[in-house]
Amino acid sequence: GITNINCSGHIWVEPATIFKMGMNISIYCQAAIKNCQPRKLHFYKNGIKERFQITRINKTTARLWYKNFLEPHASMYCTAECPKHFQETLICGKDISSGYPPDIPDEVTCVIYEYSGNMTCTWNAGKLTYIDTKYVVHVKSLETEEEQQYLTSSYINISTDSLQGGKKYLVWVQAANALGMEESKQLQIHLDDIVIPSAAVISRAETINATVPKTIIYWDSQTTIEKVSCEMRYKATTNQTWNVKEFDTNFTYVQQSEFYLEPNIKYVFQVRCQETGKRYWQPWSSLFFHKTPETVPQVTSKAFQHDTWNSGLTVASISTGHLTSDNRGDIG
């Protein structure tokens, strides 16, 4: 960067090189050029010459003032006009940064995705800091009192093999950058309570012609967890509100769920599951689209085959699911 240049003097910032966004700052330039009493000192920000708020302090030093500095990063350099020199002489350069101290991390969540071999911990980092911010995840066994720390820039995957201190842990997150440090509340976890079953996937859909046509959704999961509760949500693509059906599921075979839907309408389906009675849900599965027919022929939609446009008999029916707004979080 700009800091790798050979300097003939110094450039520095008050109160510091990295500072809180929105501050008023002063940038000083002091020339130390042999055989040069500078006629004029110039400041450049990102290669553009600054024309205002420059004060000459003495023969060798000038100050540039910025009010309410809002740029996350800027490259500053200053030059001198020396007598008998045709070009400006470079004095020095500096990369400056502005940002915010971290917020207190909240919504700390740790889950174990089945078969992953990892405990994944995430949190809400709060507002953007604009500067390099690191997070230390503390994991302390409630049985052995042993504490492990993991450094990361965002979330963390911790191998379950490294969690040797039993089943109960305290987890908390420290956020730190050059402007400050904050610590989350402690989250108490039991490893058996945070497992999320292997992802449930909708594989296909078919609408069977009957007196009242019905749509069957086929879905499955590779989970080995015995007691699993699932939700399937669906809506016409033109609607805002989801209908939700709940299931207690045994994944020893492919699930078939029946829906009585309006004809000639494009629907979207998603499914998610959790270990029965536990806290965390899977994220909703990817969107699965199915269009109901207008007339008699049977219509099948397969996963990733997003649309079916057959037309068939128009028969009105009402879903039995309850209504919910689309604001459920991914894992709880």
Epitope: T17, F19, M23, S26, A178
Partner: antibody, heavy 117, light 107 residues
Framework: QVQLVQSGAEVKKPGSSVKVSCKAS????????ISWVRQAPGQGLEWMGW????????NYAQKFQGRVTITADESTSTAYMELSSLRSEDTAVYYC??????????WGQGTLVTVSS | DIQMTQSPSSLSASVGDRVTITCRAS??????LNWYQQKPGKAPKLLIY???SLQSGVPSRFSGSGSGTDFTLTISSLQPEDFATYYC?????????FGQGTKVEIK
């Protein structure tokens, strides 16, 4: 030659406030910022905050936020540091310092503040 | 906040010895590091600024080096007047922070 001259020693009761002054001479007072640094007996140096005299901009260490107020009077070339809600741990020598290069190249002689009941 | 860690916390040396004091920052601070000397009952005195620039009037036996997180103050040949406590200080971000100090004593 720049000189920073601080006010004299103070003895204060816990819960009270102290205001230390720092008068600059021999240079343009408003050209550079003034920082306040304290040193408890037998301990290291601790930065408390900074003021840009000409602009009135301040920046305080979080540890002192809400208890310290740094001000400057350009007309008398004097900076002030007021610390409130004093406790015994605030017993220290308080220095004002100014940097005309990166770092503090001019320091006041220090003001001993003793907090005792 | 950026933590500054000096080592050693104290050392004994003789006149003429070469003395090295190190300072480590808890995160990269570029070259925004200054070194001070303090004698009992006196205000600190700036020796080195911007990691390696010798302050005007300071003897050339003092030198500084380093960038990023690791910095060194070297006294090439210790003189009787150099027995004092030395502090590093970062000016990269507020709060400005100092190392805990290194006391150089006579052996």
């Amino acid at each position: 030659q720049v000189q920073l001259v601080q006010s004299g020693a103070e003895v204060k009761k816990p819960g009270s406030s102290v205001k230390v002054s720092c008068k600059a001479s021999g240079g343009t007072f408003s050209s550079y910022g003034i920082s306040w640094v304290r040193q408890a007996p037998g301990q290291g140096l601790e930065w408390m905050g900074w003021i840009s005299a000409i602009f009135g901009t301040t920046n305080y260490a979080q540890k002192f936020q809400g208890r310290v107020t740094i001000t400057a009077d350009e007309s008398t070339s004097t900076a002030y540091m007021e610390l409130s809600s004093l406790r015994s741990e605030d017993t220290a020598v308080y220095y004002c310092a100014r940097g005309t290069v990166p770092g503090f190249d001019y320091w006041g002689q220090g003001t001993l503040v003793t907090v005792s009941s | 906040d950026i933590q500054m860690t000096q080592s050693p916390s104290s050392l004994s040396a003789s006149v003429g010895d070469r003395v090295t004091i190190t300072c480590r920052a808890s995160q990269s601070i570029g070259e925004d590091l200054n070194w001070y000397q303090q004698k009992p009952g006196k205000a600190p005195k700036l020796l080195i600024y911007a990691a390696s620039s010798l302050q005007s009037g300071v003897p050339s036996r003092f030198s500084g080096s380093g960038s990023g997180t690791d910095f060194t103050l070297t006294i090439s040949s210790l003189q009787p007047e150099d027995f004092a406590t030395y502090y590093c200080q970062q000016s990269y971000s507020t709060p400005l922070t100092f190392g805990q100090g290194t006391k150089v004593e006579i052996k």
